[in-house]
Amino acid sequence: DVERTTCPPEKEVHEIDESLIFYKKRELEACVDAALLAAQMDRVDAIPFTYEQLDVLKHKLDELYPQGYPESVIRHLGHLFLKMSPEDIRKWNVTSLETLKALLKVSKGHEMSAQVATLIDRVVVGRGQLDKDTVDTLTAFCPGCLCSLSPERLSSVPPSVIGAVRPQDLDTCGPRQLDVLYPKARLAFQNMSGSEYFVKIRPFLGGAPTEDVKALSQQNVSMDLATFMKLRREAVLPLTVAEVQKLLGPHVEGLKVEEQHSPVRDWILKQRQDDLDTLGLGLQGGIPNGYLILDLSVREALS
């Protein structure tokens, strides 16, 4: 922490301006009034403070606002945002998308994924739900940031907003997030025709259950292999060879390259070798002919 000293009279600060860049750390600490700093935050970003000096300014604001900064200050943080930790941000209440945009711009090119994720979380909490304007802002200023939200937060997305989400916005989403988003997407796109529906639903299919994947296999969709590889393992395992062949169409030829990778590997192990042979790809590892499969888990459940 910065050592406390008295401010020399000639160094007293009456406004935030460029002269402050010549102040030493201890002079900034002693001479800058926190309330003045907060009132003139909009000037800070235009002044080329060093990172050390920014540390002092942050310390000032932390003392003034121990419960978290007000949005009037947050909006004008500028490069001071780079000094914030997720713990700092967790104390904020942010409702303005202008504030979000300003801080997302500042964070670009810096390793701040944890801070950005926390900031977005605070915006969603502050606004009450993940509305269309928020989604539009995220997709425009922070592609991929949607996936930084927890499944709980994502559950506040109304289905009507799903159409604003682009495929690249979902690239970093995990299975739990897609589990939340998929039913909303299904609802949002339910009135579309077969091929149009598939194009729209495809980025969300990592959250689809087996019955929906089976239904798609009856619709001549020709699912590409990249999408197939992102399906839930649990959704793929019950599919028959015939269903996978219908689902993938010409893309089924790509299964050979993915033979050793999940979920293809696990799926192969559950198929009869005779059936796998019909794919004409030399896939190996299926259940040999004449073998009987006993599902012991069923017996255990009954006893």
């Epitope: 010409p250 004409g280 790809l281």
Partner: antibody, heavy 121, light 107 residues
Amino acid sequence: EVQLVQSGAEVKKPGASVKVSCKASGYTFTNYWMHWVRQAPGQGLEWMGNINPSQGGPYYNERFRSRVTMTVDKSTSTAYMELSSLRSEDTAVYYCARPYYGSSYGYFDYWGQGTTVTVSS
Amino acid sequence: DIQMTQSPSSLSASVGDRVTITCKASQDINKYIAWYQQKPGKAPKLLIHYTSELQPGVPSRFSGSGSGTDFTFTISSLQPEDIATYYCLQYANPLRTFGGGTKVEIK
């Protein structure tokens, strides 16, 4: 050694059909799909389609869909490509090609010697 | 379908020259491109796959680079036996497509 041996040159009249064969040896025929590629005189290579040799399911280039039929005879490890309603623009060398599944959907590492089909009245 | 635009369609260079051919894909194909050499009356011969992986027995003067949509094939020092037409092939999609070809001649 992998070999794809194609049938001999053909001369056909416009409106007729031609059936080109490709006999595979040196590998398990039912483990690799067979592809067909054609090349008109002085032109580039054009992918026509492929066929699953195990159960005969073909996929065609949209351009040829209405006129091409690809089949296989597993017992002789032979693939066939039949093109109907021939016109002069179908004059070309027709190749069968086997993919190597090293990455993605596979690139062609073995080719037949080519079959010249001439369509002329 | 993915279109492959190859350029130039023909080129003339001297023995020992560095020759560069480009292929542009109409959409992202990662690194799934192969390059073939075809001599008159012969079937195409695979030189390179997965953008830059040289086939066994192919001279090291042949090389490839790129990813996404823009790819380059290079002959570092042109030899008389390299006179041929060269084609790119995308296999990122099961419906394969070739570039239009580049005819390489000696000046």
